[in-house]
């Protein structure tokens, strides 16, 4: 006896109660591949989740996180809270960056300020909880009598602040 179920396309299921007729998936369900004997229940994006893509008869809904949260896990299975700039997310919630560290993102951890003196430079702009320090010319360049024709030292490459 030929299995007629293999002929059932995505968006349908093989209804054994009706002589293996291909029946459309009921509302709020889907089948993403052919030959399915059941349709899967659509994911519901509610609460802290919001719908990024509606469920169709052939594909599941896709969720995102509402404002103030970001996705974690496969297919945004979890929502983790954002913190403010100048904070980091710990196991016990958002905590301010300690002195000498900063975070300019809504997620991630606080990182140490750049140590300008390692590059032979001085601090031009002090760091804050939200911003790294800005390094300026070396102290020698700022001393009286220093040649103003000395070109400034090359800037740090972006993304190379110490971790």
């Amino acid at each position: 006896l030929q299995d007629l179920c293999s002929n059932c396309p995505a968006g349908t299921f093989c209804d054994n109660n009706r002589s293996q007729i291909c029946s459309p998936c009921p509302p709020n369900s889907f089948s993403s591949a052919g030959g399915q004997r059941t349709c899967d229940i659509c994911r519901q994006c509610k609460g802290v989740f919001k719908t990024r893509k509606e469920c169709s008869s052939t594909s599941n809904a896709e969720c995102d996180c509402i404002s103030g949260y970001h996705c974690l896990g496969a297919e945004c299975s979890m929502c983790e809270q954002d913190c403010k700039q100048g904070q980091e997310l710990t196991k016990k919630g958002c905590k301010d960056c300690c002195f000498g560290t900063f975070n300019d993102q809504k997620r991630g951890i606080c990182r140490p300020w750049t140590n300008c003196s390692l590059d032979g430079k001085s601090v031009l702009v002090n760091g804050t909880k939200e911003r790294d320090v800005v390094c300026g010319p070396s102290p020698a360049d700022l001393s009286p009598g220093a040649s103003s024709a000395t070109p400034p030292a090359p800037a740090r490459e972006p993304g190379h602040s110490p971790q």
């Epitope: 710990t90 196991k91 016990k92 951890i109």
Partner: nanobody, 124 residues
Amino acid sequence: EVQLLESGGGLVQPGGSLRLSCAASGFTFSNYAMTWVRQAPGKGLEWVSSISGSGDSTYYADSVKGRFTISRDNSKNTLYLQMNSLRAEDTAVYYCAKEGTGTTSDYYYNVDVWGQGTTVTVSS
């Protein structure tokens, strides 16, 4: 491939108990700290408890301290969460997670792999 598979969730009455398990594979289980987190309906992720790779250090969120116990059996590559005196506010999807090192604390998240979750419903 690193995999974490939770089980043991279900419906329980307030005051009741449940024991969640998390079967780990694809990595040297005893070398890594493990963590339980949960997500209640309509809320964000909440840290529950963490345990070091050797099992000698454990940490708990204030909301579960004295009611939940985290443990591990490194010979079986399994993490556990014994939940007693359950309350309605413990209703959530519980996820087991692998941390990036063998040590842990109640401060930094250091999670690099998540399980799929198991649902715990506390209701009369």
